[in-house]
């Protein structure tokens, strides 16, 4: 099984735009790393910005779903 | 080992077109970030563009957008650089690099010329 | 875009020196920076990443340091494989930005 933790000090530039960087530990595997990406960003390591129509459409379901 | 080896650089006219590659060994490709980056003789380094083998996505430094694209053949663990309407002050030295944590390992570099 | 600033732009030192080079970014850039080498016609090869993390292999005479907006490249006894030029890089957003360049040079 594998689960996430956060990335050590030395990992954490794996994500840009101020990313929340991730490493997915898992026995059988190598360390993979995963980011949460700062409102406005997406991609693997958030590089991707999101437009500014789907960013509106994002916040109007999460206050739906509140 | 991990090695990068560019190719495909050379003499071009302005407003041509050049298809640089970039063939990877010794890491897992698809895992990887890859850039581009230029030197121009006598002068700094300049970032041209990146690509995410894994999900396809790239960027491009204003200079280049709309001129060059970056690609990525997984099975073949090369990424490509094409370069089109090239203009005198492309010239330079090109360069990919691998990213993990910042840009950890360079090919040799190609060189580009644009010139009539 | 992120503009990087370094200084000097040159400097001369022997065989020994302490050496000093600073990096400063037009905006915060967290502990996203990182610092290269190169030797004339090679490749540039990284040293520092994140701010203070020294690469795989590199020598613990080179360190780093800072954050925000303001970095240092230290070389703690400079040796003759030392003279190269130096340059920091951003790394917290796209467009990736280089410093201009500090070119270590023999007294």
């Known amino acids: 099984t594998s689960h996430l933790v956060k990335c050590a000090e030395k990992e954490k530039t794996f994500c840009v735009n101020g990313g929340e960087c991730f490493m997915v530990k898992d026995l059988s595997n190598p360390s993979r790393y995963l980011c949460k990406c700062q409102p406005g960003f997406t991609g693997a390591r958030c590089t991707e910005n999101v437009p500014m129509k789907v960013q509106n459409q994002e916040k109007a379901e999460e206050l739906y779903q509140k | 080992e991990v090695q990068l080896v560019e190719s495909g650089g050379g003499l071009v006219q302005p407003g041509g077109s050049l298809r640089l590659s970039c063939a990877a060994s010794?890491?897992?490709?698809?895992?990887?970030?890859i850039h581009w980056v230029r030197q121009a003789p006598g002068k700094g380094l300049e970032w041209v563009a990146a690509?995410?083998?894994?999900?396809?996505?790239?960027n491009y430094a204003d200079s280049v957008k709309g001129r060059f694209t970056i690609s990525a053949d997984t099975s073949k663990n090369t990424a490509y650089l094409q370069m089109n309407s090239l203009r005198a002050e492309d010239t330079a030295v090109y360069y990919c690099?691998?990213?993990?944590?910042?840009?950890?390992?360079w090919g040799q570099g190609t060189l580009v010329t644009v010139s009539s | 875009d992120i503009q990087m600033t370094q200084s000097p732009s040159s400097l001369s030192a022997s065989v020994g020196d302490r050496v000093t080079i600073t990096c400063r970014a037009s905006?915060?850039?967290?502990?996203?920076l990182a610092w290269y080498q190169q030797k004339p016609g090679k490749a540039p090869k990284l040293l520092i990443y994140?701010?203070?993390n020294l690469e795989s292999g590199v020598p613990s005479r080179f360190s780093g340091s800072g954050s925000g907006t303001d970095f240092t490249l230290t070389i703690s006894s400079l040796q003759p494989e030392d003279f190269a030029t130096y340059y920091c890089?951003?790394?917290?957003?796209?467009?990736?930005?280089f410093g201009q360049g500090t070119k270590v040079e023999i007294k």
């Open positions: 690099a691998t990213y993990m944590f910042a840009m950890d390992y």
């Open positions: 010794g890491f897992t490709f698809s895992g990887t970030w």
């Open positions: 690509i995410t083998p894994a999900d396809g996505s790239t």
């Open positions: 905006q915060d850039v967290k502990k996203s």
């Open positions: 994140g701010a203070s």
């Open positions: 890089q951003q790394h917290y957003t796209l467009p990736l930005t």
